[in-house]
């Protein structure tokens, strides 16, 4: 396995779990059904993975290019201030919002959005791949 | 599509309790917020307050708090507003509406036009 | 937070560049500040949301601007079909409050 935690870079390992892609150093996994934010966390979280924490610019547009117009959770909420799960702040884009109760965030093709965290929707997971994907 | 379905009009007496209803249609009425707006013949629309079908939490303007009362039928997808005491000033059309990821209120119901006549 | 929206009324010739605005006694978040045009006898409609982006089938002669406590809509060339009433929202917390209305006349 990846040394470290789930939010580390995980270079140096080769492979993905079925049904996850491999995009630079990390497996992603985007989901077919929908499930409320919280649930989506919980779902990535006993996979060993997170929801999608984005690091760059250059990551989110990579990520893109697989998505559509359906909204797809991210590991991004409002606490007094938009914050990944890694606790890191939202620094490279900015997000749309209609209403103060859309505390949690989801992405798109065409960016990210914030949305009420009841409201069911597709997700994304990362994770670190593995060395030997048996261990999966 | 989405829809709301709301009874065209409904006559109560000065007093008496009207129970207004919402019937909500083509997705799942569980997860999103449910508004009631007031709005008098040739003026302006006021707030009442929403519920959240997912758990019946709710809120309220203080101005209607002590009179309305929002409550939800999740089995039929039915969102309801209980007016009581009513007088003439309550004469209006009630609409719910429901709110959406990227627009903030995009489905409205067609409005319920409550007459308070003797 | 009250919305004050001015003119009450306002009557223009079709062609005409027309601009509404919407004053909120505290400052509200352009995220939460949205538009709904209502015509007579019809549910309102959401028209411009976060105050700036057209809802989906809005002509691109509405636009939205502004920040803080002050807002406004504008039609560059106004049309028969843009009659009704425009109302702002705030969207940025409790109580939801719309503004009195601005109703559109066209000559």
């Known amino acids: 396995l990846c040394q470290g935690s789930n939010y580390s870079t995980c270079a140096s390992c080769p492979s993905c779990p079925d049904r996850w892609m491999k995009y630079g150093n990390h497996c992603y996994y985007f989901s077919v059904e929908e499930k409320d934010w919280n649930s989506s966390l919980e779902f990535c979280l006993a996979r060993d993975s997170h929801l999608l924490v984005i690091t760059d610019n250059q990551e989110m547009s990579l990520l893109q290019v697989f998505l559509s117009e359906a909204f797809c959770w991210i590991g991004l909420r409002n606490n007094s201030g938009w914050r990944w799960e890694d606790g890191s702040p939202l620094n490279f884009s900015r997000i749309s919002s209609n209403s103060f109760v859309q505390t949690c965030g989801a992405i798109n093709k065409n960016g990210l959005q914030a949305s009420s965290c009841e409201v069911p929707l597709h997700w994304v997971c990362k994770k670190c791949p593995f060395a030997d994907q048996a261990l999966f | 599509q989405v829809q709301l379905q709301q009874p065209g009009a409904e006559f109560v007496k000065p007093g008496a309790s009207v129970k207004l209803s919402c019937k909500a249609s083509g997705y799942t009425f569980t997860s999103y917020w449910i508004h009631w707006m007031k709005q008098r013949p040739g003026q302006g629309l006021e707030w009442i307050g929403n519920i959240y079908p997912g758990r019946s939490n709710n809120n309220y303007n203080e101005k209607f708090k002590n009179r309305a009362t929002l409550t939800v039928d999740t089995s039929s997808s039915t969102a309801y507003m209980q007016f009581r005491s009513l007088t003439s000033d309550d004469s209006a059309v009630y609409y719910c509406?429901?709110?959406?990821?990227?627009?903030?209120?995009?489905?409205w119901g067609q409005g319920t036009l409550v007459t308070v006549s003797a | 937070n009250v919305l004050t929206q001015s003119p009450a009324i306002m009557s223009a010739s079709p062609g005409e560049k027309v601009t509404m605005t919407c004053r909120a006694s505290?400052?509200?978040?352009?995220?939460?500040l949205h538009w709904y045009q209502q015509k007579s006898g019809a549910s309102p409609k959401i028209w411009i949301y976060?105050?700036?982006n057209l809802a989906s089938a809005v002509p691109a002669r509405f636009s939205g601007s502004g920040s803080g406590t002050s807002y406004s809509l504008t039609i560059s060339s106004v049309e028969a079909e843009d009659a009704a009433t425009y109302y702002c929202q705030q969207y940025s917390g409790y109580p939801l409050t719309f503004g009195g209305g601005t109703k559109l006349e066209i000559k």
């Open positions: 509406a429901r709110d959406a990821t990227v627009e903030p209120l995009p489905y």
């Open positions: 976060s105050t700036s």
């Open positions: 505290s400052s509200v978040s352009s995220n939460y």
